[in-house]
């Protein structure tokens, strides 16, 4: 594959990454799969600057990101280290709340109205953001 040099149509470029912002909702796993099919991943927030960029584009709407603890510890989908990385949880979050009546706890992270993060039921259909890095090799064949 060739190195991607510009973002696909309808994606937004920012700091050598491309972002796609959904306008409807999906469960976390479906959103994750959607991004993977686009040769991307759910957004991984690594800095305050990136947080503000994403927040500006999504507006005050609950929106999935690529962070979950479905297998125990919190993990970013691209392997970025959670413990040492950027975090922006709401007060008292994550809390793995069981009181929602949907079954189980809360294992997936999302941006809330003010941009701070909350853990929620992964089955809830929220909007989502895909991200792919411009510098990574594309799966598309090179143009001849």
């Amino acid at each position: 594959g060739s190195e991607r040099t510009c973002c696909p149509v309808n994606w937004v470029e920012h700091e050598r990454s491309c972002y796609w912002f959904s306008r409807s909702g999906k469960a976390w796993a479906d959103a994750d799969n959607y991004c993977r099919l686009e040769d991307a991943h759910l957004v991984v927030v690594t800095s305050w600057e990136e947080q503000k960029f994403v927040q500006h584009h999504i507006g005050p709407v609950n929106t999935w990101m690529g962070l979950h603890d479905q297998n125990g510890p919190w993990k970013w989908v691209d392997g970025t280290d959670y413990e040492t990385g950027f975090k922006n949880w709401r007060p008292e979050q994550p809390d793995d709340w069981y009181g929602h009546g949907l079954g189980g706890g809360e294992d997936c992270a999302h941006f809330t109205d003010d941009g701070r993060w909350n853990d929620d039921v992964c089955q809830r259909p929220y909007r989502w953001v895909c991200e792919t890095e411009l510098d990574k090799a594309s799966q598309e064949p090179p143009l001849l």
Partner: antibody, heavy 121, light 112 residues
Framework: QVQLVESGGGVVQPGRSLRLSCAAS????????MHWVRQAPGKGLEWVAI????????YYTDSVKGRFTISRDNSKNTLYLQMNSLRAEDTAVYYC??????????????WGQGTLVTVSS | DIVMTQTPLSLSVTPGQPASISCKSS???????????LYWYLQKPGQPPQLLIY???NRFSGVPDRFSGSGSGTDFTLKISRVEAEDVGVYYC?????????FGQGTKVEIK
């Protein structure tokens, strides 16, 4: 404009079954969670069931669990409520209602006019 | 299940006068996302319910500004600053923080 039209109500004997339908138009049906809400004659509102936009998740109020099944056909823009083992206390006007947004919103902003189900021997 | 308790259950109001309805929930309706999942609906005679207020205090589109909602946690209030004849009907509060979603018993508002 958004329209929800329920049908399938009527008089049915206790223990029998009935299937309600709700035909949706004026919006992208497959993007929205849908609900059934009922109202017994002269009484208040009772939430009955919810189904996810894609049909993957369904939840019910305790009094109908195991008897009622909510389903949808996104190709037909139609919501259903299969009601089995009906009881006198299921007598009500049944409304279908649409979620407020095409993502989880926690409220209904559009309702149908309702269809009356009467369970009586 | 979360129990929603409305008071009063009926209200007779002179046109132009204010009205207030209280709704109390048996558990906090504040979610981890910072929203409070409390809603107000009005059901006019012979009609399905219509949304008035979402997330405690936000008026739904087309709802007159004489309607306002307030409260937090478990205690909520719907106020009508000046009641008009078209405001008659039954007002319901509803919570959706927990399945099953539950409604208050309803408050019937009539004009004196």
């Amino acid at each position: 404009q958004v329209q929800l039209v329920e049908s399938g109500g009527g008089v049915v004997q206790p223990g029998r079954s009935l299937r309600l339908s709700c035909a949706a138009s004026g919006f992208t049906f497959s993007n929205y969670g849908m609900h059934w809400v009922r109202q017994a004659p002269g009484k208040g509102l009772e939430w009955v069931a919810i189904i996810w936009y894609d049909g993957t998740n369904k939840y019910y109020t305790d009094s109908v669990k195991g008897r009622f099944t909510i389903s949808r056909d996104n190709s037909k823009n139609t919501l259903y409520l299969q009601m089995n083992s009906l009881r006198a206390e299921d007598t009500a006007v049944y409304y279908c209602a649409r979620e407020g947004h095409d993502f989880w919103s926690g409220f209904f902003c559009y309702w149908g006019q309702g269809t009356l189900v009467t369970v009586s021997s | 299940d979360i129990v929603m308790t409305q008071t009063p259950l009926s209200l007779s109001v002179t046109p132009g006068q204010p009205a207030s309805i209280s709704c109390k929930s048996s558990q906090s309706l504040l979610h981890g996302d910072g929203k409070t999942y409390l809603y107000w609906y009005l059901q006019k005679p012979g009609q399905p319910p219509q949304l008035l207020i979402y997330e405690v205090s936000n008026r739904f589109s087309g709802v007159p500004d004489r309607f306002s909602g307030s409260g937090s946690g478990t205690d909520f209030t719907l106020k009508i600053s000046r009641v008009e004849a078209e405001d008659v009907g039954v007002y319901y509060c509803m919570q959706s923080i927990q399945i099953p979603w539950t409604f208050g018993q309803g408050t019937k508002v009539e004009i004196k």
